[in-house]
């Protein structure tokens, strides 16, 4: 089978600081030297790009400076962290992996991770 399988956790709960981390693992059918990882958010039938990074195998993946994502890579595994999340960002986050080089190109799409974000309660004013 030429398809690339991508695995990611079904559910993740963001921290009280709005940070969510999950692992995206892919079974590579080819010997890729360049890999692109994209986090997509699916709401209803709309899919939008959250962040994307391209990395050379053996090197670290680097997101743009203004990205809300950070990550590290190890072999066929990528550890992704999304920051700055609020309750309204609760939703399905899909890990998309593309083997960009050398040809042939392969596409792998995970089933998505449902990230739940709960806004922290504001601290009550204290009298002392």
């Amino acid at each position: 089978c030429k398809a690339m399988h991508v695995a990611q956790p079904a559910v993740v709960l963001a921290s009280s600081r709005g940070i969510a981390s999950f692992v995206c693992e892919y079974a590579s059918p080819g010997k890729a030297t360049e890999v692109r990882v994209t986090v997509l958010r699916q709401a209803d039938s709309q899919v939008t790009e959250v962040c994307a990074a391209t990395y050379m195998m053996g090197n670290e993946l680097t997101f743009l400076d203004d990205s809300i994502c950070t990550g590290t890579s190890s072999g066929n595994q990528v550890n992704l962290t999304i920051q700055g999340l609020r309750a309204m960002d609760t939703g399905l986050y899909i890990c998309k992996v593309e083997l960009m080089y050398p040809p042939p190109y392969y596409l792998g799409i995970g089933n998505g991770t449902q990230i739940y974000v709960i806004d922290p309660e504001p601290c009550p004013d204290s009298d002392f």
């Epitope: 089978c1 030429k2 398809a3 997509l40 899919v47 994307a52 391209t54 960009m100 080089y101």
Partner: antibody
């Protein structure tokens, strides 16, 4: 809304060259892989080539490898196809196509006809 | 490359009838990466189904897709006059991205 408008088609002699353009609007061009798909008269669809995102990676069908070159200008939201050493079998309607974020081909231009004939 | 074969080549049916179109792959294709397109004369193809079974935006529910591995099916439950067209399957999981040769659905 997403719009793809091809231009540059026409009649060219065998061995000649032609450059097709595709003007894109209504979406963040640099976030999408952009493809060319062609259709010979009365025939089926044939994928030709793709250029990904920032333009650093591209892939071609064997039938056009070494003769066609895909490129893109993300600042102008434009995709190009430079076709050299054209053959009669390259005669087709050429479609500019957006690869959706999940991979499928969700938006197609109206197509531009390329005729290779002496 | 993955070769897609479609059958039948032509399907002659009447409005209101059920149409069943088949797409077979030369090797296993993940259902995540199988699409169906409709094309009418003089028009560009239009996406109907992606991921083997998900309907694209604005596609009526009389169109449905199913299948896995090497065998996929597009079903039109009750043909409307505007459904008479050519239908193509496509795999988009690996390059070269390939299309089937098409099935023409025409009026009996």
């Amino acid at each position: 809304q997403v719009q793809l408008v091809e231009s540059g088609g026409g009649v060219v002699q065998p061995g000649g060259s032609l450059r097709l353009s595709c003007a894109a609007s209504g979406f963040t061009f640099s976030s999408y892989g952009m493809h060319w798909v062609r259709q010979a008269p009365g025939k089926g669809l044939e994928w030709v080539t793709v250029m990904w995102y920032d333009g650093s990676n591209k892939h071609y069908a064997d039938s056009v490898k070494g003769r066609f070159t895909i490129s893109r200008d993300n600042s102008k939201n434009t995709l190009y196809l430079q076709m050299n050493s054209l053959r009669a079998e390259d005669t087709a309607v050429y479609y500019c196509v957006r690869g959706e974020l999940l991979g499928y081909f969700d938006n197609w231009g109206q197509g531009t006809l390329v005729t290779v004939s002496s | 490359e993955i070769v897609l074969t479609q059958s039948p080549g032509t399907l002659s049916l009447s409005p209101g009838e059920r149409a069943t179109l088949s797409c077979r792959a030369s090797q296993s294709v993940s259902s995540s990466y199988l699409a169906w397109y409709q094309q009418k004369p003089g028009q560009a193809p239009r996406l109907l189904i992606y991921g083997a079974s998900s309907r694209a935006t604005g596609i009526p529910d009389r169109f449905s897709g199913s299948g896995s591995g090497t065998d996929f099916t597009l079903t039109i439950s009750r043909l409307e006059p505007e459904d008479f067209a050519v239908y193509y399957c496509q795999q988009y999981g690996t390059s070269p991205f390939t299309f089937g040769p098409g099935t023409k659905v025409d009026i009996k």
